[in-house]
């Protein structure tokens, strides 16, 4: 399986909410013998490898933000710790895996990484990650709502989390 980032860059005004999304695709076994572990963290663009450094998102570690579920299930973080920090991660039936950040500030700007570990019981494990940039802007040059720029050369899209 692989992880695709739907958008490589999100540009948002301060105070807005945004949902960053990764999508798991490829030969995903939806049986009971597969478990997915998924999480988010902040990082920096290394010279060789993006996402190798793991930094907290609003003081929450990748352990705090992780989800785990079977191949056929959806999941989300409903615990108070994440919500108190204005964060929620979620995973749906279609392979979309997201983190929603509320009330953005300039300090939220940076590189965000999603990590997915697929555990095929009695067989193997495999891990992949994806990366995207978040730019939070203020002042007259800031957009009125979040704009997401696709990973490929398509048109940008206005997106704002509810």
């Amino acid at each position: 399986f692989k992880v695709a980032t739907l958008y490589s860059l999100y540009v948002c005004p301060e105070g807005q909410n945004v949902t960053l999304t990764c999508r798991v695709f490829g030969p995903v076994d939806k049986g009971h013998d597969v478990t997915f572990y998924k999480t988010w963290y902040r990082s920096s663009r290394g010279e060789v490898q993006t996402c190798s450094e793991r930094r907290p998102i609003r003081n929450l570690t990748f352990q705090d933000l992780h989800l785990h579920h079977g191949g056929h299930q959806a999941a989300n973080t409903s615990h108070d710790l994440a919500q108190r920090h204005g964060l929620e991660s979620a995973s749906d039936h279609h392979g979309n895996f997201s983190i929603t950040m509320r009330n953005l500030t300039l300090l939220d700007s940076g590189l965000y990484c999603c990590l997915v570990v697929e555990i095929r019981h009695h067989h193997s494990e495999h891990r992949v990650h994806g990366a995207m940039e978040l730019q939070v802007q203020t002042g007259k040059d800031a957009p009125s709502s979040c704009v997401a720029y696709p990973s490929s050369s398509q048109e940008s899209e206005n997106i704002t989390a509810a």
């Epitope: 478990t35 490898q49 190798s52 450094e53 990748f62 785990h68 570990v117 555990i119 495999h126 992949v128």
Partner: antibody, heavy 120, light 106 residues
Framework: QLQLQESGPGLVKPSETLSLTCIVS??????????WGWIRQPPGKGLEWIGS???????HYNPSLKSRVTIPVDTSKNQFSLKLSSVTAADSAVYYC????????????WGQGTLVTVSS | DIQMTQSPSSLSASVGDRVTITCQAS??????LTWYQQKPGNAPKLLIY???NLETGVPSRFSGSGSGTDFTFTINSLQPEDVATYFC????????FGGGTKVEIK
């Protein structure tokens, strides 16, 4: 602080079954984010991963040992075990139990190891 | 399974020297590689994960780099307490270890 402690006989006869137990303290073996595994090291040689058990009871085994290995877990006693059947002298080694964090990847906590000799 | 080839198998260097160990994977493992230090009679100790991340409490003279199939572990200024055997291990798939490098002081 998490601690792992191996226990079991130091001498096993050829063709018999090697049985070791790892007692975990300072943390729950039922935590969903971890594998609990066994690694061995023949005297003066390198490390060989034997297998791991997931909190749910599912297992991963080294393909080269798969036919001889089982790793049971007893969550009520907060411990897991290693059973290696039909042992030979080549199975003589220091056996370590260890924890792997699923999200981080490496083995981050290890027991101190126990030497098992296979000899008649 | 993924094979890990570590070299050299042993080395001898002087205190203060820069020491380099390499590890090569038989297929692309992204950056899912860790380095351990094992002193005689002890269990291995985690030093570096994700190829370049230093575990908390590990001295900064230790570093790691690499991606894909080729990885390097460096001790910037060898100290007497660094005498040990060092192992790499991949965790892109089921864990496999390199053969180890024994580091001694000249």
């Amino acid at each position: 602080q998490l601690q792992l402690q191996e226990s079991g006989p130091g001498l096993v006869k050829p063709s018999e079954t090697l049985s070791l137990t790892c007692i975990v303290s300072g943390g729950s073996i039922s935590s969903s984010g971890y594998y609990w595994g066994w690694i061995r090291q023949p005297p003066g040689k390198g490390l060989e991963w034997i297998g791991s058990i997931f909190y749910s009871g599912n297992t991963h085994y080294n393909p080269s040992l798969k036919s001889r290995v089982t790793i049971p877990v007893d969550t009520s006693k907060n411990q897991f075990s290693l059973k290696l059947s039909s042992v030979t002298a080549a199975d003589s080694a220091v056996y370590y139990c260890a924890r792997r964090d699923i999200l981080t990847g490496p083995f981050d906590y290890w027991g101190q190891g126990t030497l098992v000799t296979v000899s008649s | 399974d993924i094979q890990m080839t570590q070299s050299p198998s042993s080395l001898s260097a002087s205190v203060g020297d820069r020491v380099t160990i390499t590890c090569q994977a038989s297929q692309d493992i992204t950056n899912y590689l860790t380095w351990y230090q094992q002193k005689p009679g002890n269990a291995p100790k985690l030093l570096i994960y994700d190829a370049s991340n230093l575990e908390t409490g590990v001295p900064s003279r230790f570093s790691g780099s690499g991606s894909g199939t080729d990885f390097t572990f460096t001790i910037n200024s060898l100290q007497p307490e660094d005498v040990a055997t060092y192992f790499c291990q991949q965790y892109d798939n089921l864990p496999t270890f390199g053969g180890g490098t024994k580091v001694e002081i000249k």
